[in-house]
Interface confidence: medium
């Protein structure tokens, strides 16, 4: 039975040209995290595997940095980066947990962070 929950940074906004940290946290389970995938729609951004280490997809290596922790830092943001991001936690023995973050990249300087929320 999957008892865990994923807490994410929720809906967030950031300025064009700036950077943002995408963060998820798995709680309420003793399952072992074997891998975390970060995806944007159908594109794989990065992987953090417990044994094999971090890997950033080739097309994102110049502006995506691993961390902090199991999070992901997006740099040199463009308006095209606006959209849904998913953290996918592969765990044993529970299975897969998925968290969703919506990022809006703004032209102006009125970007502000949204509240945290949970996905069961």
């Amino acid at each position: 039975m999957m008892t865990g929950t994923i807490e994410t940074t929720g809906n967030i906004s950031a300025e064009k040209g700036g950077s943002i940290i995408l963060q998820c946290h798995l709680s309420s389970t003793t399952a072992q995290v074997t891998q975390v995938n970060w995806e944007q729609q159908d594109q794989l951004l990065a992987i953090c595997n417990a044994d094999l280490g971090w890997h950033i997809s080739p097309s994102f290596k110049d502006r995506v940095a691993p961390g902090p922790g199991l999070g992901l830092t997006l740099q040199s943001l463009t308006v095209n980066d606006t959209g849904e991001y998913f953290c996918i936690y592969h765990t044993y023995p529970d299975g897969t947990y998925t968290g969703r973050i919506f990022l809006e990249v703004l032209e102006s300087s009125v970007a502000e962070h949204g509240a945290r929320f949970q996905i069961p």
Partner: antibody
Framework: EVQLQQSGPELVKPGASVKMSCKAS????????MHWVKQKPGQGLEWIGY????????KYNEKFKGKATLTSDKSSSTAYMELSSLTSEDSAVYYC????????????WGQGTSVTVSS | EVVLTQSPAITAASLGQKVTITCSAN?????VHWYQQKSGTSPKPWIY???KLASGVPARFSGSGSGTSYSLTISSMGAEDAAIYYC?????????FGAGTKLEIK
């Protein structure tokens, strides 16, 4: 210079076990995952599994669970693979290969250990 | 499990000829690499992450592709290029290889 030196050829009887070694030099063994790959004569490459010498964590191809056992010895910078209950299907060359986390690929390979199962 | 199918299985090319080897996946593949293996030797990394040439690989080699279709191309076949080429992918938690393409000199 990174080198993976594998143990010599083995001729074993059906039903027996064999343990081969892969000695790493030129880098710290605990910093890189070690993979093992099987190649039957005249055939392609088949992934067996890997061991993380840092914490002895292993991951196996389902097909090789119960057949292969991966271990490592940090003090001698050596990775081992034991194959059990051998049959003619296990006759092959077995390679160890270092995992490069930057590319998520195998960057250095041992010269291979040939295993022949015959009565 | 992601299954990689290489084609052709065997091909022959004249010196100076352009050669293309393909690797198709039954579902979207991650981190596709190519290895070269010559008879009696261990495989060598040849192309990393679809298109990055490994150290020492001649510039006449190139790699491309995305999703389920990938290819290795030699712009001008060289004598030392005769070998077997394998594609490989990693998709949690399995590593799989293609069956290989044997490239010979015509």
């Amino acid at each position: 210079e990174v080198q993976l030196q594998q143990s010599g050829p083995e001729l074993v009887k059906p039903g027996a076990s064999v343990k081969m070694s892969c000695k790493a030099s030129g880098y710290t063994i605990t910093s890189y995952v070690m993979h093992w790959v099987k190649q039957k004569p005249g055939q392609g490459l088949e992934w067996i599994g890997y061991i993380n010498p840092y914490n002895d964590g292993t991951k196996y191809n389902e097909k090789f669970k119960g057949k292969a056992t991966l271990t490592s010895d940090k003090s001698s910078s050596t990775a081992y693979m034991e194959l059990s209950s051998l049959t003619s299907e296990d006759s092959a060359v077995y390679y160890c290969a270092r995992w490069n986390p930057y590319y998520y690929a195998m960057d250095y390979w041992g010269q291979g250990t040939s295993v022949t199962v015959s009565s | 499990e992601v299954v990689l199918t290489q084609s052709p299985a065997i091909t022959a090319a004249s010196l100076g000829q352009k050669v293309t080897i393909t690797c198709s996946a039954n579902s979207s593949a991650r981190y596709v690499h190519w290895y070269q293996q010559k008879s009696g030797t261990s495989p060598k990394p040849w192309i990393y992450e679809i298109s990055k040439l490994a150290s020492g690989v001649p510039a006449r080699f190139s790699g491309s592709g995305s999703g389920t279709s990938y290819s290795l191309t030699i712009s001008s076949m060289g004598a030392e290029d005769a070998a077997i080429y394998y594609c490989q992918q990693w998709n949690y938690p399995l590593i799989t290889f293609g069956a290989g393409t044997k490239l010979e000199i015509k």
